[in-house]
Amino acid sequence: FGISGKHFITVTTFTSAGNIGEDGTLSCTFEPDIKLNGIVIQWLKEGIKGLVHEFKEGKDDLSQQHEMFRGRTAVFADQVVVGNASLRLKNVQLTDAGTYTCYIRTSKGKGNANLEYKTGAFSMPEINVDYNASSESLRCEAPRWFPQPTVAWASQVDQGANFSEVSNTSFELNSENVTMKVVSVLYNVTINNTYSCMIENDIAKATGDIKVTDSEVKRRSQLQLLNSGP
């Protein structure tokens, strides 16, 4: 956090995670200043000479930008006056992980804050009833994870039960040779029960729920990024 006072403004960053191969956002906010031309935003990365991005006098200045970020960054220009200095990052790579600094200078003063950016892969799981199996089973699939996650099953009826003996999990490397497809099969399931497939690594936690009854199958999935926040 920046130090409040005559020459310092408060700058706030949020630890966030990037999904490789997709757009990412490095979040940073500051005390707003209506004088756009007086606002300078600089993004720096620890261990990198040159800037990640610079925005000043109402426009981008990439004259000092490091080559690894060329054509991959942009601020949300229309939101700068309201105190948004967040950076959009194109095609997130594993090598983008690290410590970033959001440095702000306005007519009110200056300030900076650090941000820890994690990169990996995470995706929503989908659970389906596997009718091909000899006994009723559930198949939980998630297309992209990295680093390799842990997979656990739970059930509403048998709370606290250990399903490791009646499940089989495999990790299949995807075509880009980094991320992996996660497939987990749970055997001997009973109807009128809700089962959960939980996939977790140090970046994200995803849960897929399925409720199987005589008349219908209900599904729900959710994804939560870990350690994200100020």
Epitope: G21, H53, K59, D61, L62, R70, G71, N91, S175
Partner: antibody
Amino acid sequence: EVQLVQSGAEVKKPGASVKVSCKASGYTFTSYWIGWVRQAPGQGLEWIGDIYPGGGYTNYNEKFKGRVTITRDTSTSTAYLELSSLRSEDTAVYYCARLDGSSYRGAMDSWGQGTLVTVSS
Amino acid sequence: DIQMTQSPSSLSASVGDRVTITCKASQGFNKYVAWYQQKPGKAPKLLIYYTSTLQPGVPSRFSGSGSGRDYTLTISSLQPEDFATYYCLQYGDLLYAFGQGTKVEIK
């Protein structure tokens, strides 16, 4: 409204060079990448390269390296494509296009009307 | 460099048909695939970017999907004005690349 207006048709002899211009208006010229794409008669689209007018940074298709130069003049908000050592297979319509996303190189969202370059002896 | 292999190269369809065009990337994973429509003598028009985001003003019968190396453009109910050539574009790599194009003709 974003507008890209290209220079007129050109007829060139094999071995010569051609320089096609693309004048931009309706947005901040230095803030968005501009790309060049060509299309030979009856053929598909082929990406040539692009430039960031705010810094003059360029990217080129390996196929054209050494023969193509993309430049810009910020005072007139104009981008240029120069292709040298022309051969008959360079006969095509050449398009300029603005890339979406400002300093972020996005997809091409606004296009010029195209410039026909004919290479013939 | 990432190449895009588009199929089919041409197809015949009738008004009201559901049409699907695919592009396969030679390597890697990224969501940076756009789709363009081009009519004879005209510049290409952006329909979809970032795999599935519809460009403003483009009818909702156009949709994009895909993951990994496989990407798809779908026209849910073909209209007379949709007969044209369609191209995919890979723009995640430093070097951009178009697919070879798919000509959609009237059956």
